[in-house]
Amino acid sequence: EPPTACREKQYLINSQCCSLCQPGQKLVSDCTEFTETECLPCGESEFLDTWNRETHCHQHKYCDPNLGLRVQQKGTSETDTICTCEEGWHCTSEACESCVLHRSCSPGFGVKQIATGVSDTICEPCPVGFFSNVSSAFEKCHPWTSCETKDLVVQQAGTNKTDVVCGPQDRLR
């Protein structure tokens, strides 16, 4: 009876279990009753990082110098190239597809530490009593306005993104 499931590192095709190609190799032809799976190594600048039945290898990532990228780790037949940014610049994401001078802290967050050549901006959430309503790479969280010191009262509570709104005290007639 033909199998309905195969072992690890195998795949089911034409009612039979064939071996997957190992990382660094692509599929040329499926196995048959009489022959093994045929695999070929990926070419220069190509890779496959899993046991697979792919008929094409993936191209290594290109670290575009026009985007500030350079090679951190050269790719192999089993691994993709890893890019990083030129010194003083920072990756926009884990995949490092482009570089920015420094990231900004979003509203609700303040700058804890300004970026340097080696470390990006460090942000921190604004605690109760403080707010930030801007995206910035240098502004800290600002304290809420003290209505009392202006002889006013709080008309609208502050949040981590907005200041309090002060207004006149209700005068008793």
């Epitope: 030129e86 570089c99 920015v100 001078l101 900004s104 995206s135 910035s136 790479a137 240098f138």
Partner: nanobody, 116 residues
Framework: EVQLLESGGGLVQPGGSLRLSCAAS????????MWWVRQAPGKGLERVSA????????YYADSVKGRFTISRDNSKNTLYLQMNSLRAEDTAVYYC?????????RGQGTLVTVSS
């Protein structure tokens, strides 16, 4: 396309002054935080000064505090850096930058050389 054109650099003696300008185009200048950064020969990028979109809040690196003043004219789409009491260690290429600045958006910079 973002364009930032720095000017005003040159050779100046220690203790002298220079005013750098940065003409911005290709984006709404008044909406963006702006920065001056510099790169000395053989050194990394140093963040020198920054200003918020309205020009009401500023930042200065400790190395330039009290000597440099950042300002902006939103009606002219221009950023400025007034540099006084210049020192040899201020020698660098100065770049202006918007937030965020992608590598491909950077200007050519203007060279400031402080030497007697």
């Amino acid at each position: 396309e973002v364009q930032l054109l720095e000017s005003g650099g040159g050779l100046v003696q220690p203790g002298g002054s220079l005013r750098l300008s940065c003409a911005a185009s290709g984006f709404t200048f008044r909406d963006y935080e702006m920065w001056w950064v510099r790169q000395a020969p053989g050194k990394g990028l140093e963040r020198v000064s920054a200003i918020n979109p309205q020009g009401t809040r500023t930042y200065y690196a400790d190395s330039v505090k009290g000597r440099f003043t950042i300002s902006r004219d939103n009606s002219k789409n221009t950023l400025y850096l007034q540099m006084n009491s210049l020192r040899a260690e201020d020698t660098a290429v100065y770049y202006c930058a918007k937030l965020p600045t992608y590598f491909s958006d950077r200007g050519q910079g203007t060279l400031v050389t402080v030497s007697s």
